[in-house]
């Protein structure tokens, strides 16, 4: 089930998924001057099973100037290049897919693929957020959001995180001072879709990336 | 340029089988989820089934479920849909497609006496 | 399952005008639909992707819009070779579901 909406907006944080539940689409986009080929895909999805997730399909951009000529097409992890992202650049430390059932990880990026990337998530994903260079976490529970599934509608969870101005970078979970353990967070309902198994694990698998903001759109 | 011919349509006898195959071309094959999709005689569109690229994910129609099996051979480019216990009501022109902006030409598969 | 209700069935129309088709999804697709072409006797052809795309060496005529569970195709300056039937395909979720068709008809 895809979610409905965007994940909430935290004035001046940033989000990203550390892993992609099944079903998660990434739409094939290109940057100004490029256009997807004909060949190429229109979305990527994250298929698989309980043992193995992997992202099915090849974005691939082609100038808009020229009809024939191709750009690289995702690369394997060994070719990845530094991701160019909107507001900073960092390098990502791969994770084993299988670290994660069920899940892909972030796939690599494609020449001249467009500086946001267009997600379109499923009901359980997770997603963490970050303060803006400049601003500093301040947190009253966990820096994260669920989609979850509620009398038949799709919503996001909202995140405890208040960013304040003041020179100092918060980093993704694990890589700051441990929060609130999920029992703590200020849920009523009981209809929540990750278990505190998925959050353990995905915090635990969080641990192991360095930090990683880009900014991301969706529709 | 992307290609996909399916083959292997004809006349079949209700509760018999078919198995139709799609060639592919002009693209990394194996890095693509595939789809059947079927056009009964006169009517709209029906989509049968998918795979992904490694094979790991099948989805079906309700309607074909238990029935109809959709595999590929990567090294050989090539989608198959395997069909048994067939209905009349499975009657159509079978497409392969590639997410949606490629399609094949069509098989036709007829189920009667 | 997600309903793809298209509309009209069939309508009749001359050359030169503009006209718009609609599919309404029973739930929001977050503009995982595409538009088809399919020409009397021949197979399928992309026009629009992602709502709104056009795809590659489709003529400038052929518009997507729309957003949420509501998308329309227009057509603008109809062209002889435009006659035929369209459908919309939603990507958004298993099972993918097709609208009904609209059969575009000479007047």
């Known amino acids: 089930e895809l979610c409905d909406d965007d994940p909430p907006e935290i004035p001046h944080a940033t989000f990203k998924a550390m892993a992609y539940k099944e079903g998660t689409m990434l739409n094939c986009e290109c940057k100004r001057g490029f256009r997807r080929i004909k060949s190429g895909s229109l979305y990527m999805l994250c298929t698989g099973n309980s043992s193995h997730s992997s992202w099915d399909n090849q974005c691939q951009c082609t100038s808009s100037a020229t009809r024939n000529t191709t750009k690289q097409v995702t690369p394997q992890p060994e070719e990845q290049k530094e991701r160019k992202t909107t507001e900073m650049q960092s390098p990502m430390q791969p994770v084993d897919q299988a670290s994660l059932p069920g899940h892909c990880r972030e796939p690599p990026p494609w020449e001249n693929e467009a500086t946001e990337r267009i997600y379109h998530f499923v009901v359980g994903q997770m997603v963490y957020y970050q303060c803006v260079q400049g601003y500093r976490a301040l947190h009253r529970g966990p820096a994260e959001s669920v989609c979850k599934m509620t009398h038949g509608k799709t919503r996001w969870t909202q995140p405890q995180l208040i960013c304040t101005g003041e020179m100092e970078t918060s980093q993704f979970p694990g890589e700051e001072k441990p929060q609130a353990s999920p029992e703590g967070r200020p849920e009523s309902e009981t209809s929540c879709l990750v278990t505190t198994t998925d959050f353990q694990i995905q915090t635990e698998m969080a641990a192991t990336m360095e930090t990683s903001i880009f900014t991301t759109e969706y529709q | 340029d992307v290609q996909l011919v399916e083959s292997g349509g004809g006349l079949v006898q209700p509760g018999g089988s078919r198995k139709l195959s799609c060639a592919a071309s002009g693209f990394t094959f194996s890095t693509f989820g595939m789809h059947w999709v079927r056009q009964a005689p006169e009517k709209g569109l029906e989509w049968v089934a998918y795979i992904s690229s490694g094979s790991s994910t099948v989805y079906y129609a309700d309607r074909v479920r238990g029935r109809f099996t959709i595999s590929r051979d990567n090294p050989k480019n090539t989608l198959f849909l395997e069909m048994t216990s067939l209905r009349s009501e499975d009657t159509a022109m079978y497409y392969c497609?590639?997410?949606?902006?490629?399609w094949g030409q069509g098989t036709l598969v007829t189920v009667s006496t | 399952d997600i309903l793809m209700t298209q509309s009209p069935s069939s309508m009749s129309v001359s050359l030169g005008d503009t006209v718009t088709i609609t599919c309404h999804a029973s739930?929001?697709?977050?503009?995982?639909i595409v538009w088809l072409q399919q020409k009397p006797g021949k197979s399928f052809k992309g026009l629009i992707y992602?709502?709104?795309n056009l795809e590659d060496g489709v003529p400038s005529r052929f518009s997507g819009s729309g957003s949420g569970a509501d998308y329309s195709l227009t057509i603008s300056s109809l062209e002889s070779e435009d006659f035929a039937d369209y459908y919309c395909v939603q990507y958004a979720q298993f099972p993918r579901t097709f609208g009904g068709g609209t059969k575009l008809e000479i007047k």
């Open positions: 497609a590639r997410d949606w902006m490629n």
């Open positions: 992602h709502g709104t």
């Open positions: 739930q929001g697709i977050r503009s995982n």
